[in-house]
Amino acid sequence: YDFTNCDFEKIKAAYLSTISKDLITYMSGTKSTEFNNTVSCSNRPHCLTEIQSLTFNPTAGCASLAKEMFAMKTKAALAIWCPGYSETQINATQAMKKARKSKVTTNKCLEQVSQLQGLWRRFNRPLLKQQGSSDYKDDDDKHHHHHH
C-alpha cells in the first residue's frame, strides 16, 4: 500500500490522543535504556510503511502484536484516513485470524514496540533536509529526502 495520500495530520491526532498511551501502557515496567532503535524512516509515507510492517507482520519471537489495543487502533486510523487502505488489508486480516489467539508479551515484542514508538516519533516530526521552505508538513513530505 502507498501511504502517500493519507491524511497525516488526522493520523497524528489519533496517535497522540490514544495510540501513544496504549504503547506506553504496553511498555510499562521496561527500562528506558533497554532498547536501541534500529529501524528508521525518512518521511511520513515511509514511516507509515514501517509502522504497518512492525505492527501487523508477525516476526520471529513476536507473533501477537496485531491483537493488541494499539494495533487495533492503528488499523482503524489507517482505514479511516488512508484512501483504499481497508481493501488492501483483507488478506492480512485473514492471516491475523490464523495467528495465535493468546497475547504473549515477550522481550522481542517489547523491543518491537520500542521500535514502533521511535517510528511514530519520526512520523510526528520527520527530521528533513532543509530545502526552500524547509518544513515537514504533510504535503511536502514526499518531495524531501532524509539529510545525512
Partner: antibody, heavy 119, light 107 residues
Framework: EVQLVQSGAEVKKPGSSVKVSCKAS????????IEWVRQAPGQGLEWIGV????????NYNENFKGRATLTADKSTSTAYMELSSLRSEDTAVYYC????????????WGQGTTVTVSS | DIVMTQSPDSLAVSLGERATINCKAS??????VTWYQQKPGQSPKLLIY???NHYTGVPDRFSGSGSGTDFTFTISSLQAEDVAVYYC?????????FGQGTKLEIK
C-alpha cells in the same frame, strides 16, 4: 532518571568559537532527538537546531546556518553544539533539550550553559 | 518563518483567579503547539503538548486549547508557585519558533 548535564560557563572573545556539551543519561541516547535552544539575557527562547544522535541527521535554523554545528557521540551519550564567529549578540544561555516520547515537545532540558562574548 | 505572538506580554492575577494567555501564529500550525513554563534562573519546563495534552505530572489547573492560528493557555486557579514566564512554541514547520513569552505575576 533522565538527565541532561551541560558543560560549564564560557567567556569568549569576538570572532572565536565555543563548543558546549550535553551529556545524556537515563535513556537510550540514540532513540531521541536533541534540540538546542538559546536565551539572551532578559529575552525569549530561540531554536538553534536539532540532531538525531542515531544517525547524525541535523536541521538548523537558517539564522545559525554556517555558524552552528551540531554533533553527537553515541559512545559517550554526549551531544555538542559549536558556534563559530562569535559576536556580542551571541551572549546567552544555551540549552540542550530532549524530544518527548511522542516527538512533539521537549520534555527534558539541560541546566543551561552561559556563554559570554566580550572583548 | 512562522511568528508566534503572545498576548499580553505581562499579566497580574489574584491568587485563586483564572489566568489566560493567548498565542497567535502568523500562519496555520494545525495543532502543533506546546506550552512551557520558565521560572527565574531555571530551565523551561514542559506543561502542555499538541495543544491540549498534559505532560506527565502537570496539574489539571493548566490547560490549552485552539487550532490553526489561535491558541489559548489557561490556569484555572492561580497558585503562588505559578509565577513564571510562559512560552508557546510551534513545531509545525522548521525553524521551530517560540512566542516572546508572557510574564505572570500575582496581583
Amino acid at each position: 532518571e533522565v538527565q541532561l548535564v551541560q558543560s560549564g560557563a564560557e567567556v569568549k572573545k569576538p570572532g572565536s568559537s565555543v563548543k558546549v556539551s550535553c551529556k545524556a543519561s537515563g535513556y537510550a541516547f540514540s532513540n531521541y532527538l536533541i534540540e538546542w535552544v538559546r536565551q539572551a539575557p532578559g529575552q525569549g527562547l530561540e531554536w538553534i537546531g536539532v540532531i538525531d544522535p542515531g544517525n547524525g541527521d541535523t536541521n538548523y535554523n537558517e539564522n545559525f546556518k554556517g555558524r552552528a554545528t551540531l554533533t553527537a557521540d553515541k559512545s559517550t551519550s554526549t551531544a555538542y553544539m559549536e558556534l563559530s564567529s562569535l559576536r556580542s549578540e551571541d551572549t546567552a544561555v544555551y540549552y540542550c533539550a530532549r524530544e518527548d516520547n511522542t516527538g512533539t515537545a521537549f520534555d527534558y532540558w539541560g541546566q543551561g550553559t552561559t556563554v559570554t562574548v566580550s572583548s | 518563518d512562522i511568528v508566534m505572538t503572545q498576548s499580553p506580554d505581562s499579566l497580574a492575577v489574584s491568587l485563586g483567579e483564572r489566568a489566560t494567555i493567548n498565542c497567535k501564529a502568523s500562519q496555520s500550525v494545525s495543532s502543533d503547539v506546546t506550552w512551557y513554563q520558565q521560572k527565574p534562573g531555571q530551565s523551561p519546563k514542559l506543561l502542555i503538548y499538541y495543544v491540549s495534552n498534559h505532560y506527565t505530572g502537570v496539574p489539571d489547573r493548566f490547560s490549552g486549547s485552539g487550532s490553526g492560528t489561535d491558541f489559548t493557555f489557561t490556569i484555572s486557579s492561580l497558585q503562588a508557585e505559578d509565577v513564571a514566564v510562559y512560552y508557546c512554541q510551534q513545531h509545525h514547520r522548521f525553524p521551530l519558533t517560540f512566542g516572546q513569552g508572557t510574564k505572570l505575576e500575582i496581583k
